[in-house]
């Protein structure tokens, strides 16, 4: 807390300008009117205040707005945003995407801080859902943003927002998150033709069920191995050798390099060695000829 002292004669600030950088902390406290500061917040960023001076300015705004800053002030906080705590931000009501962008710009190039996470959370909750424009903005600043959300939070993403998602935005998503996103993507892209559809849906396929993979195998999509390796193991296991061959097209020879990695390893164990041999890739580990395969899960279901 800065002690309350009278402003020296002739030092009362008429506007927020560069002369204030020569003010001591107590002079800023005594001579800068909080209401003036609030209306001229846009000027603060252009002035090279010290961290200590910024603390004083924040203190003045806190006194003026104990219930939380209005959006007109928030939008122009600039570097003063870095002084805010998550507790401060929880008092705000940010509704404008421009305000959000302005504050994200301040933190650009850095990891998502607790302040930014709180800001985004407040903004999204205020909007009720993660709309396309918001998602566009957030993923532009933080490509990993989408994958930082829980499956529950992702369920509020409307299918129309999926158009804003780029492949790199899904790089760090786990299978549970893709399980939520895939049906939304399928819905969003449903009116596209075969090859265009595959380009768009490809990044989401880690959430695709077996029947969708079987359908894709009939469409000459030529899935690359990087995509194939991201598929759910339980979705890949029921695919036949012929279906995998059609799904991968010319990339099928890549199975050899991945034969020890999931899901290829587990898929190989489920195939007849005879069928694997038809690929001519030297894949080993299939079910030997003459062996009978019992599906115990089916037997349990019948009993």
């Amino acid at each position: 807390e800065v002690e309350k002292t009278a402003c020296p004669s002739g030092k009362k600030a008429r506007e927020i300008d560069e002369s204030l950088i020569f003010y001591k902390k107590w002079e800023l406290e005594a001579c800068v009117d909080a209401a003036l500061l609030a209306t001229q917040m846009d000027r603060v960023n252009a002035i090279p205040f010290t961290y200590e001076q910024l603390d004083v300015l924040k203190h003045k705004l806190d006194e003026l707005y104990p219930q939380g800053y209005p959006e007109s002030v928030i939008q122009h906080l600039g570097y003063l945003f870095l002084k805010m705590s998550p507790e401060d931000i929880r008092k705000w009501n940010v509704t404008s995407l421009e305000t959000l962008k302005a504050l994200l710009e301040v933190n650009k190039g850095h990891e998502m801080s607790p302040q930014v996470a709180t800001l985004i959370d407040r903004f999204v909750k205020g909007r009720g859902q993660l709309d396309k424009d918001t998602l566009d903005t957030l993923t532009a600043f933080y490509p990993g943003y989408l994958c930082s959300l829980s499956p529950e939070e992702l369920s509020s993403v409307p299918p129309s927002s999926i158009w804003a998602v780029r492949p790199q935005d899904l790089d760090t998503c786990d299978p549970r998150q893709l399980d939520v996103l895939y049906p939304k993507a399928r819905l969003a892209f449903q009116n596209m033709n075969g090859s265009e559809y595959f380009v768009k849906i490809q990044s989401f396929l880690g959430g695709a069920p077996t029947e969708d993979l079987k359908a894709l195998s009939q469409q000459n999509v030529s899935m690359d191995l990087a995509t194939f390796m991201k598929l759910r193991t339980d979705a890949v296991l029921p695919l036949t050798v012929a279906e995998v061959q059609k799904l991968l097209g010319p990339h099928v020879e890549g199975l050899k390099a991945e034969e020890r990695h999931r899901p290829v390893r587990d898929w190989i164990l489920r195939q007849r060695q005879d069928d694997l041999d038809t690929l001519g890739l030297g894949l080993q580990g299939g079910i030997p000829n003459g062996y009978l395969v019992l599906d115990l899960s089916m037997q349990e279901a019948l009993s």
Partner: antibody, heavy 119, light 108 residues
Framework: EVQLQQSGPELVKPGASVKIPCKAS????????MDWVKQSHGKGLEWIGD????????IYNQKFNGKATLTVDKSSSTAYMELRSLTSEDTAVYYC????????????WGTGTTVTVSS | QIVLTQSPAIMSASPGEKVTLTCSAS???????LCWYRQKPGSSPELWIY???NLASGVPARFSGSGSGTSYSLTISSMEAEDAASYFC?????????FGGGTKLGMK
Amino acid sequence: EVQLQQSGPELVKPGASVKIPCKASGYTFTDYNMDWVKQSHGKGLEWIGDINPNTDDTIYNQKFNGKATLTVDKSSSTAYMELRSLTSEDTAVYYCSRRLIGTGYFDVWGTGTTVTVSS
Amino acid sequence: QIVLTQSPAIMSASPGEKVTLTCSASSSVISTYLCWYRQKPGSSPELWIYSTSNLASGVPARFSGSGSGTSYSLTISSMEAEDAASYFCHQWSNYPYTFGGGTKLGMK
């Protein structure tokens, strides 16, 4: 430009462990497996194992089972190899190398980290 | 495991000379699964030839690769000073992946 940046030389005592980072840049980290190779004067190049960054699924050359542990941190596009219970036999240059998923050749190699085990 | 034996271990060639390096496998390797790396002293290895005969990006056309089964080779049609280096063959047909012991090629 695609780069695999490894840490500088390590001088470690017998019995100790060392963790070597390999920071990837200039490409989509999850489209490539990360393989590790040992190069020593006596034995030439030896494949240690690989890791798939999507699934953290690892495969090891049996010879290095229990000796090497491979991990990745997707958020920082960094692969790591930890070597434990070091002996003079482990003195070598260790390389990370990327391998496009679905191929078996290493199209980009790291800068290499020299590990010297000596008391 | 598949053992790859390279010969000769060390050799030198004159400028313009044709050079052939060989790599012999202890058991059959599918040609798609064999490649070659080049390594200059003090540097990391670099991919030189993949799938037996495909030149990696930036590799001069004087290099070529051939072979099948257990016998593979790398050929330089006309030796140049910058080709002096060690060359290693590598197979990924079987686990564990293995490398040849290398051929150290010098300039006469």
